[in-house]
Amino acid sequence: AESCTSRPHITVVEGEPFYLKHCSCSLAHEIETTTKSWYKSSGSQEHVELNPRSSSRIALHDCVLEFWPVELNDTGSYFFQMKNYTQKWKLNVIRRNKHSCFTERQVTSKIVEVKKFFQITCENSYYQTLVNSTSLYKNCKKLLLENNKNPTIKKNAEFEDQGYYSCVHFLHHNGKLFNITKTFNITIVEDRSNIVPVLLGPKLNHVAVELGKNVRLNCSALLNEEDVIYWMFGEENGSDPNIHEEKEMRIMTPEGKWHASKVLRIENIGESNLNVLYNCTVASTGGTDTKSFILVRKADMADIPGHVFTR
C-alpha cells in the first residue's frame, strides 16, 4: 500500500493529479464508524469543509483526498480530522514551465560516480492501475526503451549520462488524459577524488529587470577545492562602475566536495546592461562549464520566444 503523506509542507506542479493520504489510515476499524472530515483554509477562507460537491476536481476516498488535477488556486492549508486525530499539510501549487517538459523547482538532484551503477526506474505505485503508458525523457528528448509501462535505465555511468531525466506517466481518469512528471537532475562526477565541476541550473537565463533598479545574479556550482568560479562580461569589464562581484561563498558537501556561490551585483540598471551576456564560468583542470544571464526589460519578456527557455 502507498505510504501516507507525512511531509507537512508540499510543493506540486499545477495540472497534475495529486493526492493527500492521512497517516491514521491503518486504523481501519475506526474508519468505518467514525466521522471523517477534510478541510481547506487559505488567505480568504477559514476551514471550509471539502466534499466532491465543492469541486469536480476533488475526490474523497477512505484515507485519501485526490485532485484531478491540482490547480494554482488549490494552494493553502489542508486538514484531516477524525475523532481526536488531526493532520495538517501546507500545499504550495506552482506554475508549470510551459517551455520545457519539466518544472525546474520540482527536480530531484542525484550525484553518480562515473563507472558506478546508475539506475533510473519510472514507477508510480499510487496511480499504477490507472497508468496507460510511461515515457522517459533525457533533456526533454524521448528515450526509446523497450518497456513502456515502467521504463528503466540500468548501466555503469558515463559522463555522457549527465542530464535531466523525466519520467512522464500518462493516465486516464473519468475520460480525461492526465500526466504526472518526475524529473531527476543527474550529475556524473569523477570517481575517487575529483569531480567534473558543474554549474547548477539552466545554461541560459533571461532575467526580467526594471531600469534604474538593482539585480543580483547568483551563480552556483559543485566543484573541487582547487577549482575556480568567476564572472566574465563584455570585452572590457572595466567600463561599468555599477557592476560588482561579491565574495565567493563555499560550503563543503558531505562527499567532501564544495558547493560554491558567486553573485554579480548590477546596480542602477541602464540600457547598456540589457541584452548582453553575463557569463559565469567554473573551471578545473578537467574542463569548464559556463552559464549565461541576459537582462531583459520586464515589458519585453513576453516577446521572448519559448525555445530560448529550453536548456
Partner: nanobody, 116 residues
C-alpha cells in the same frame, strides 16, 4: 603538461609597487588567454586580472582597477602583473592560470605581503 612558475612577490609597504611574472617551465601557453588569481588567508581564489591570448583585451576586478596592469610577452612565454599603490588588503598568494578555459595545474604561487 604546462608547468606554471610565479615569481616577483615579496614584502612591501602600503603604497609601494611590485611586478609579478608567470612563466611556463614546461610547455607553452602563448595561445591561451591568461589571468592572475589571488588567495588571501581563509578566502577562495579570486580572479583579479585577465588578458586575451594576443594581449589586446584586458579586464580587472573592481578591487584592483586603476592600480594593477596585466600584460604579456608571447615571445618569452610570460605574463606579468604590475601592482601599484598596494594596500594591506592585497596581501595574498598570487597565481596565474588560463582564463577562460580548462585550468593548467596550479603553480606554487608567489606571496605578496603589504604592511601598513
Amino acid at each position: 603538461e604546462v608547468q606554471l612558475v610565479e615569481s616577483g612577490g615579496g614584502l612591501v609597504q602600503a603604497g609601494g609597487s611590485l611586478r609579478l611574472s608567470c612563466a611556463a617551465s614546461r610547455g607553452t601557453f602563448t595561445g591561451d588567454p591568461m589571468g592572475w588569481f589571488r588567495r588571501a588567508p581563509g578566502e577562495q581564489r579570486e580572479l583579479v586580472a585577465r588578458i586575451s591570448s594576443g594581449g589586446s583585451t584586458t579586464n580587472y576586478a573592481d578591487s584592483v582597477k586603476g592600480r594593477f596592469t596585466i600584460s604579456r610577452d608571447n615571445a618569452k612565454n610570460t605574463v606579468y602583473l604590475q601592482m601599484n599603490s598596494l594596500k594591506p588588503e592585497d596581501t595574498a598568494v598570487y597565481y596565474c592560470n588560463r582564463v577562460p578555459g580548462s585550468l593548467h595545474y596550479w603553480g606554487q604561487g608567489t606571496q605578496v605581503t603589504v604592511s601598513s
